[in-house]
């Protein structure tokens, strides 16, 4: 069976890394495990990994925004940032604003790698399933 | 044969959903049908679906912009928004501006699903083939 | 073996097209050659091609930004722009700013095609491996 995941925003995320809806809606999870915000790889190989995060706020103050996909493995002491997007000076002060960050690329992943998504400012994330998501598939 | 599509912007249309060039240029269409703006799935399975839209204008007034990929199937009463990007407060009032929205993710699609792209303001879309496109491929 | 590449930003790029790190870090290069900034296709077929570029600056002057993936083949007289992103009026004058451009789509590539990435303003690109990259894989 094809190893694939597409997880969508979960609005009761209260800490980092982001947590994801893994059951309802347009979710996919096959041949990959989901555990505490992370996608757990169980077969070494090449994977296309992607994520989109939708940031929005009522009154722009241009707080720097970052969106990272990173990897953790108990063999390594430190998280590895695989992909990252940053935004600064992106809206007009005081105005209602909205913006997305999209990341996607190919990586060689190893069994037991855990993949996560991090954002700089959780309160500015909108978790609609069509707007904020995290996924991968094995090539 | 691999089921794949890459359609590019078609500028002489004023209708929603967006219509696409399905014949000339860097277009691909194999094992998938194109009908009235939509990509029609004829084999159930996992697909990576993507779209980019290039918005631009002569004088910024920060009109809210949205870019959606949605699915329609005669079995279901309502369209399903698969992916969406929104932008608000994205340019400096009165200036010439330009911005892109990119969407891409994996979905489990069913034979006879129709996929479309919608935008909130057609007048602000530039249809160059390298800038505005819609595609998918079966994993 | 799967034909795949993921190249990351190389900060000593001084000219166009962009040059890439093809050896160290989270780089992948298998069944595809890298030559003077370009990915060289050696087997005709369908490829998903992607790139992200991270632009940033100390003081916004809204210099128009462009990010292109283009193709060159000795059989054709002119470069073919496959995908392009443009940004204008994207930050507040005088402020420190940061923004990304992401491109990704499917193309039918031919043996000996050379793929490159071009940007309008090299001095505004940040080359961190997680932020600026260029890749592809054969479907």
């Amino acid at each position: 069976l094809r190893k694939v995941a597409h997880l969508t925003g979960k609005s009761n995320s209260r800490s980092m890394p982001l947590e994801w809806e893994d059951t309802y809606g347009i979710v996919l999870l096959s041949g990959v495990k989901y555990k505490k915000g992370g996608l757990v790889i169980n077969e070494t190989g090449l994977y296309f990994v992607y994520s989109k995060v939708y940031f929005r706020g009522q009154s722009c103050n241009n707080l720097p925004l970052s969106h990272k996909v990173y990897m953790r493995n108990s063999k390594y002491p430190q998280d590895l940032v695989m992909m990252e997007g940053k935004m600064m000076s992106y809206c007009t002060t005081g105005q209602m604003w909205a913006r997305s960050s999209y990341l996607g690329a190919v990586f060689n992943l190893t069994s037991a790698d855990h993949l996560y998504v991090n954002v700089s400012e959780l309160s500015l994330v909108n978790f609609e399933e069509s707007q904020t998501f995290f996924g991968l598939y094995k090539l | 044969l691999r089921k794949v599509a890459h359609l590019t912007g078609k500028s002489n249309s004023r209708s929603m959903p967006l219509e696409w060039e399905d014949t000339y240029g860097i277009v691909l269409l194999s094992g998938v049908k194109y009908k009235k703006g939509g990509l029609v799935i004829n084999e159930t399975g996992l697909y990576f679906v993507y779209s980019k839209v290039y918005f631009r204008g002569q004088s910024c007034n920060n009109l809210p912009l949205s870019h959606k990929v949605y699915m329609r199937n005669s079995k279901y009463p309502q369209d399903l928004v698969m992916m969406e990007g929104k932008m608000m407060s994205y340019c400096t009032t009165g200036q010439m501006w330009a911005r892109s929205s990119y969407l891409g993710a994996v979905f489990n699609l069913t034979s006879a699903d129709h996929l479309y792209v919608n935008v909130s303001e057609l007048s602000l879309v530039n249809f160059e083939e390298s800038q505005t496109f819609f595609g998918l491929y079966k994993l | 073996l799967r034909k795949v590449a993921h190249l990351t930003g190389k900060s000593n790029s001084r000219s166009m097209p962009l040059e890439w790190e093809d050896t160290y870090g989270i780089v992948l290069l298998s069944g595809v050659k890298y030559k003077k900034g370009g990915l060289v296709i050696n087997e005709t077929g369908l490829y998903f091609v992607y790139s992200k570029v991270y632009f940033r600056g100390q003081s916004c002057n809204n210099l128009p930004l462009s990010h292109k993936v283009y193709m060159r083949n000795s059989k054709y007289p002119q470069d073919l722009v496959m995908m392009e992103g443009k940004m204008m009026s994207y930050c507040t004058t005088g402020q420190m700013w940061a923004r990304s451009s992401y491109l990704g789509a499917v193309f039918n590539l031919t043996s000996a095609d050379h793929l490159y990435v071009n940007v309008s303003e090299l001095s505004l690109v940040n080359f961190e491996e997680s932020q600026t990259f260029f890749g592809l894989y054969k479907l």
């Epitope: - | 500028s11 002489n12 004023r14 007034n61 909130s120 303001e121 057609l122 007048s123 | -």
Partner: antibody, heavy 119, light 111 residues
Framework: QVQLVQSGAEVKKPGSSVKVSCKAS????????ISWVRQAPGQGLEWMGW????????QYNENFKGRVTITADKSTSTAYMELSSLRSEDTAVYFC????????????WGQGTLVTVSS | EIVMTQSPATLSVSPGERATLSCRAS??????????IHWYQQKPGQAPRLLIY???HLESGIPARFSGSGSGTEFTLTISSLQSEDFAVYYC?????????FGQGTKVEIK
């Protein structure tokens, strides 16, 4: 900058036709609708119809019962509104306005053309 | 067709005061994304000028004392502190479907 310049005032007899022009500049003529809106003396605004110069498609307000025809000439970036079978109650200022296709608000207006229908 | 009803027909306000104009649609002009209502200002002998689009968005070049609100069928245009140049007729217009229709207008006059 965006400009819409209309033709001059007209005096017409009942039963005749009038054709008002609207020359656009400062933007891509084929990417926006041109709408026509009229205003009778001391009255409110009434939308008559639109044309999309990109493909020539048009839509009309049924209140005008086939009396109105809107056309566009891409080569000169000019839109035209022709109203036939004129009657005294058609005396009004006729405005052309650029409108965004989807949002359909009128963001730039011509200066107006007074059409007087009198015997 | 959707009928747009504005109230009051005339509003007498002193310079510096707040003005609140209402517009009611005979059926909803909102979707999940936007409310398709726009406000215009017209002065004698001039073409209308767009002030607010999609119920609450200020058009480029329009002073921040103008604001719009509402959804569904009830909409409001507010002028926070009337200036002499604001005395004019104001129209709402919907673009939810064809035909586009305008309200009959509210005249804001000096008290």
């Amino acid at each position: 900058q965006v400009q819409l310049v209309q033709s001059g005032a007209e005096v017409k007899k009942p039963g005749s036709s009038v054709k008002v022009s609207c020359k656009a500049s400062g933007y891509t003529f084929t990417r926006f609708d041109i709408s026509w809106v009229r205003q009778a003396p001391g009255q409110g605004l009434e939308w008559m119809g639109w044309i999309f110069p990109g493909d020539g498609s048009s839509q009309y307000n049924e209140n005008f019962k086939g009396r109105v025809t809107i056309t566009a000439d891409k080569s000169t970036s000019t839109a035209y509104m022709e109203l036939s079978s004129l009657r005294s109650e058609d005396t009004a200022v006729y405005f052309c306005a650029r409108s965004l296709i989807s949002t359909a608000m009128f963001d730039h207006w011509g200066q107006g053309t007074l059409v007087t229908v009198s015997s | 067709e959707i009928v747009m009803t504005q109230s009051p027909a005339t509003l007498s306000v002193s310079p510096g005061e707040r003005a609140t104009l209402s517009c009611r649609a005979s059926k909803s002009v909102s979707t999940s994304d936007f409310s398709y209502i726009h406000w215009y200002q017209q002065k004698p002998g001039q073409a209308p000028r767009l002030l607010i689009y999609l119920a609450s968005h200020l058009e480029s070049g329009i002073p921040a004392r103008f604001s719009g609100s509402g959804s569904g069928t009830e909409f409001t245009l507010t002028i926070s502190s009337l200036q002499s140049e604001d005395f004019a007729v104001y129209y709402c217009q919907h673009s939810r479907e064809l035909p586009r229709t305008f309200g009959q207008g509210t005249k804001v006059e000096i008290k």
